[in-house]
Amino acid sequence: NKILVKQSPMLVAYDNAVNLSCKYSYNLFSREFRASLHKGLDSAVEVCVVYGNYSQQLQVYSKTGFNCDGKLGNESVTFYLQNLYVNQTDIYFCKIEVMYPPPYLDNEKSNGTIIHVKGKHLCPSPLFPGPSKP
């Protein structure tokens, strides 16, 4: 029995930041779980982990240097990635594992989300000029 995961097909990170919501066919309330976000077609880079335990505060961490935060819903985890680089444009996959209570459950591989990181504009656009000097 596998959990199903839904993700947006594509997101654009305009300010080098993005919210990626992973929606599950499973209620995480009062479960011990490990939700993770993986980068690349082969999911080789684990970008961020959200660990939840019915008796402890939510833990959010990255072992790979990403600036991430996480929010928990009953049937979703939202990853908030900041300080993304243009070269981190890639496909990102949500993964969920329920460790307790038994049995262990994980998800069918999702279709993933392409995150397109747009570079920051370092000078004002001609259409939106900055404030004029007095």
């Epitope: 961490y61 072992k63 594992e97």
Partner: antibody
Framework: QVQLQQPGSELMRPGASVKLSCKAS????????MHWVKQRHGQGLEWIGN????????IYDEKFKSKATLTVDTSSSTAYMHLSSLTSEDSAVFYC??????????????WGQGTSVTVSS | DIQVNQSPSSLSASLGDTITITCHAS??????LNWYQQKPGNIPKLLIY???NLHTGVPSRFSGSGSGTGFTLTISSLQPEDIATYYC?????????FGGGTKLEIK
Amino acid sequence: QVQLQQPGSELMRPGASVKLSCKASGYTFTSYWMHWVKQRHGQGLEWIGNIYPGSGRTIYDEKFKSKATLTVDTSSSTAYMHLSSLTSEDSAVFYCTRSHYGSSFDAMDYWGQGTSVTVSS
Amino acid sequence: DIQVNQSPSSLSASLGDTITITCHASQNIYVWLNWYQQKPGNIPKLLIYKASNLHTGVPSRFSGSGSGTGFTLTISSLQPEDIATYYCQQGQSYPWTFGGGTKLEIK
């Protein structure tokens, strides 16, 4: 309290194989990785690999891939390491030790007493 | 694989001294470094996790610092019971790897 119980010693012949056991108690077996660590007499610690009892997922150091096979029996909360084609190089103490699977507390916090394997003809 | 180089390999110090042991990782491991103590004839015991966090029950004279590739274990006011071999271990990526160990002796 958390306990990882291992047999004290095994005396084996060269070429034989051995299955070491590690019985866990006092915690949720499926919330932790089980690792195996080798220590030859008077030497340092070498990480062999680990297994996640929930899914059976295993990770090995390349050096030990053809030597060690890790398995678990969740019904008895026991982890096993099978060592094949034993040589004198396999004479060592083998420890089982756990680390949390989900949280950022990612260190080996409880250790078994170790099984001393002696390979001798 | 990430290599972890530990120095010195042995160290002799007097009771009451402050000593430092260093570990250098071959690539950035952020804060994912742990320290273990192994007393003669005993099993390894976790001292510090995630570079600077003292494990439960470990005396406050032990401290850890560092991030990226350079890490330090400091023992202040050395006690007789601190005679042991100390190991660092990186947990940033698999395979996990240990430093070669530092054998601490009392002068």
